[in-house]
Amino acid sequence: KSPVFGPQEVSSVEGNSVSIKCYYPPTSVNRHTRKYWCRKGASGRCITLVSSEGYVSSNYAGRANLTNFPENGTFVVNIAQLSRDDSGHYKCGLGINSRGLSFDVSLEVSQGPELPNGTEVYTVDVGRTVTIKCPFKTENAPKTKALYKKIGQTSVLVIDSRNYVNPNYKDRIRLRIPGTGQLIFTVVIDRLRLSDHGLYLCQAGDGSNRDEKNADLQVLEPEPELVYEDLRGSVTFHCALGLEVANVAKFLCRVNSRETCDVVINTLGKRDSAFEGRILLNPQDKDGSFSVVITGLRKEDEGRYLCGAHSDGQLQEGWPIQAWQLFVNEESTIPRSPTVVKGVAGGSVAVLCPYNPKESQSLKYWCLWEGAQNGRCPLLVESQGLVQEQYEGRLSLLQEPGNGTFTVILNQLTTQDAGFYWCLTNGDTRWRTTVEIKIIEGEPNLKVPGNVTAVLGETLNIPCHFPCKFSSYEKYWCKWSNTGCQTLPSQDEGPSEAFVNCDENSRLVSLTLNPVTRADEGWYWCGVKQGHFYGETAAVYVAVEEKKVAGSRYVSPAKADAAPDEKVLDSGVREIENKAIQDPRLFAEEKVVADTGDQAGGSRASVDSSSSEEQGGSSK
């Protein structure tokens, strides 16, 4: 490769000058050898235009020179009064044109804007505001002030001090004339449109004594911010449009193939069905800024997104916007997990939630997506144990299996539980994921009594029937509290073959509390799991009452009542908000469900796994 180096491309406009600097290794020979600038012709020959030995070609005469700077190993080719004819392929080099010590340079000269002398350039984003300053002399202070827009060879009046306003600028332009002594008037244009782009002329007075000032207004479309997110992950668009539109409806839209923008969500309650269950528009701050969170990213979510403000809740020309180009990386770090989990009425679901494995200490949350208005997601459970009171006894968040996944178990399912739920943490917000729970036809696999009344001081057995398909699973009973579900000590009774030859309709694992104490009152779960992966659960409420009759009480499935009356507790709603996502301590205060007492422990509680025949009852 050649040791000579320079710019591979140079772009400029007609009438301008360029200074092309070429670098060479500053050896003694190189410093003193001939330097040249030549143009490559169709034949491949390179015709010298200017050289360090004083040669200048005829079409470069008076407008080009080459200066060598041997001390730092550079030479500079200056070319003035560029024309479009100068566009082409050149070489800067050392020695003889045909030898290899050269570097290829492409020069592109385009038609430039011809701005009158003294033109002030204003560069403003679309939808924003510009203030054009127009100076004038004292003798023109009492005279008419005006702003014109130059269109071709004509000038169109935009606004003047006699209250004329061009219809194209109606309701978004004003001319301000300051008090005496200040020899400048200003024109303020709000909600700039791309069509406002162009050359303007300020004028004060008329005739030969008038004051004029040119202004070049460049209205830019916002450069889209590039956003790269992982498949199945989450993206947050933070939109700050300024105080001027703080009280105007906000929206996020996606640019389609027709270059129009389809509303994804807005503050007027509109939402694209493709984002159902996985989008939130977080309430705006006082400054009018807001954010939109989209979870469960799909490849088809890629595209150009705009946020903006307009009373119609959709894109309108001349209103401020912000832009993003979203790329969804299919080589995702976020593991696949079911996006739909199915359960039956009365049954349960166990949802696996991914989180960034580097953030094992982060707080974990689960919330219920609600689609009303802008969408919201009240928290139901968190790893520190706070649970919405109406979920008492039937919802738990477990740190297992760990290493990037936690588990949420919800049982006593009803059709009202169908919907979208979000898994999130107070750490990496890109790992928020969405799961849909669907309630389908069917019967729960685990059968427990509806509710149980135990007698103080006596023994209580609670049966849990499971089908043969769970024979290889680990069975457990646990006592639910608002900080989790504490597994009760298991007591192995009898040989394990009880579950091997599973030819009966059902098998049984039973919980024994002996003797029953006040602290035993509460919710108990029977469940199955494989290692750290949880399967179905069933819940039973145990009420404890004073002794009335002597003896032991065994609750058989035949005596199982309907599900216990649910406690209806007032609960403050906790929502995912902009700040709260980062710091869940910022959520609104709410009642905490009181812990349901000591965990049953020691020899008082035992789990007995045996066949139903041995328990003296069966469940069909």
Epitope: F5, P7, V10, S12, S17, Y23
Partner: nanobody, 128 residues
Framework: EVQLVESGGGLVQAGGSLRLSCAAS????????VGWFRQAPGKEREFVAH???????????YYGDFVKGRFTISRGTAKNTVYLQMNSLKPEDTAVYYC??????????????????WGQGTLVTVSS
Amino acid sequence: EVQLVESGGGLVQAGGSLRLSCAASGRTFSSDAVGWFRQAPGKEREFVAHIHWSGDFTTYYYYGDFVKGRFTISRGTAKNTVYLQMNSLKPEDTAVYYCAAPKGAIGDPRSTREYDYWGQGTLVTVSS
């Protein structure tokens, strides 16, 4: 104080494309020049591309030898953003990519010594 922030790195398959962004905060690029460099594990920082613009609509584009037309450096209309569009990526393009800006006039744009402000880098991984 100027802060440069790169973004757009990631994992891409050989033959794929990425667009890196370099955004300046604290002030606009009053130096009118920005360079991209890259550093592969165990190797020296290597010049990738450089853009220099004059206020009079003139722009100069410089590229490293290995680029061979695959990369394009450009400036955003916002004027405080510079992009590096990388096409036909190869596994040997795997590196941390840095953007840099000088305080004033620059000598040789290929030299890291010419630059005063550096970003924290963005990792580009090209798998075969």
